[in-house]
Amino acid sequence: YDFTNCDFEKIKAAYLSTISKDLITYMSGTKSTEFNNTVSCSNRPHCLTEIQSLTFNPTAGCASLAKEMFAMKTKAALAIWCPGYSETQINATQAMKKRRKRKVTTNKCLEQVSQLQGLWRRFNRPLLKQQ
């Protein structure tokens, strides 16, 4: 999906209002310095591409993020503020439901969510408005 035409400010507002708090809840008990952020993004569409990948694509050691509260709210925000996003996700969602197993918060998942926080931070505060 090409995130170029999303309403970035509306997605930012959704993140700051709710999604960020859910990420904090997920990471509760983890020090902010515990994981080193290695995933980066260059602009807002790229950030959303990386956020989508880390949030919804199962990875080795962490297959369980997609049903977390922050993930569901992320999905809702993208569906509302990114034209045509919902249609592209129908097949992916059905496949994900078939794969879904019990919810386990692993250290790998915590590391992945820490990376997500860094991506969202970058999405929210791009230094793109040079005078």
Epitope: E9, K10, K12, A13, Y15, L16, S17, S20, I24, S32, T33, F35, N36, N37, S40, S42, Q117, G118, W120, R121, R122, F123, N124, R125, P126, L127, L128, K129, Q130, Q131
Partner: antibody, heavy 120, light 111 residues
């Protein structure tokens, strides 16, 4: 706990340049915007510019654009602010500051400040 | 540039009394329903410290006698019951548009 440690006080001649460093420790460096703010004696706060160390992208206050250069070295977790063509009105305390964890955009960690005095 | 104008420039309030500082932006600092305005406290010889973020949210470790309100162009910082340690200079800051800009500061003293 994240800390920002700045280089020591500088005394410079008008027309010269100064380069102030800001070393981050205790946390991730590359995925946080790092800002530079200055404060002239008895005056308020003035934003100079910022850098995203992850890719070196910068944003500058137009007032300083031709004179200020902000850089970062990811390998040493250090940000730098160089100000050229110094004049007496550049005498100030220069602060580096890091944005918060959540993208709210407030400055939650500050360096101790570096006093730069410009005098002939 | 968005100009931030604080009032008053200085303020003297008795211990235990309410202190109110206003900040007006030359144009709206709101975006998608959120107000991108922060408040800082600065004591002599120290860097600023965050008090309030996004107009009304209390910063981490900040006493709840501090509160913020407002939207659009008009914002207020309130200290409900002034304590001796609140003597400082207070700054508003907008981050909605580059360049980021601060108010000129309000010096708060004890009467």
């Amino acid at each position: 706990e994240v800390q920002l440690v700045q280089s020591g006080a500088e005394v410079k001649k008008p027309g010269s340049s100064v380069k102030v460093s800001c070393k981050a420790s205790g946390g991730t460096f590359s995925t946080y915007n790092m800002h530079w703010v200055r404060q002239a004696p008895g005056q308020g706060l003035e934003w100079m510019g910022a850098i995203y160390p992850g890719n070196g992208e910068t944003s500058y206050n137009q007032k300083f654009k031709d004179r200020v250069t902000i850089t970062a070295d990811k390998s040493t977790s250090t940000a730098y602010m160089e100000l050229s063509s110094l004049r007496s009105e550049d005498t100030a305390v220069y602060y580096c500051a890091r944005e918060d964890d959540y993208g709210e955009g407030y400055f939650d960690v500050w360096g101790q400040g570096t006093t730069v005095t410009v005098s002939s | 540039d968005i100009v931030m104008t604080q009032s008053p420039d200085s303020l003297a309030v008795s211990l235990g009394e309410r202190a109110t500082i206003n900040c007006r932006a030359s144009e709206s600092v709101d975006n998608s329903g959120l107000s991108f305005m922060h408040w800082y406290q600065q004591k002599p010889g120290q860097p600023p410290k965050l008090l309030i973020y996004r107009a009304s949210n209390l910063g981490s470790g900040v006493p709840d006698r501090f509160s913020g309100s407002g939207s659009g162009t008009d914002f207020t910082l309130t200290i409900s019951s002034l304590q001796a340690e609140d003597v400082a200079v207070y700054y508003c800051q907008q981050i909605n548009t580059d360049p980021l800009t601060f108010g000129q500061g309000t010096k708060l003293e004890i009467k």
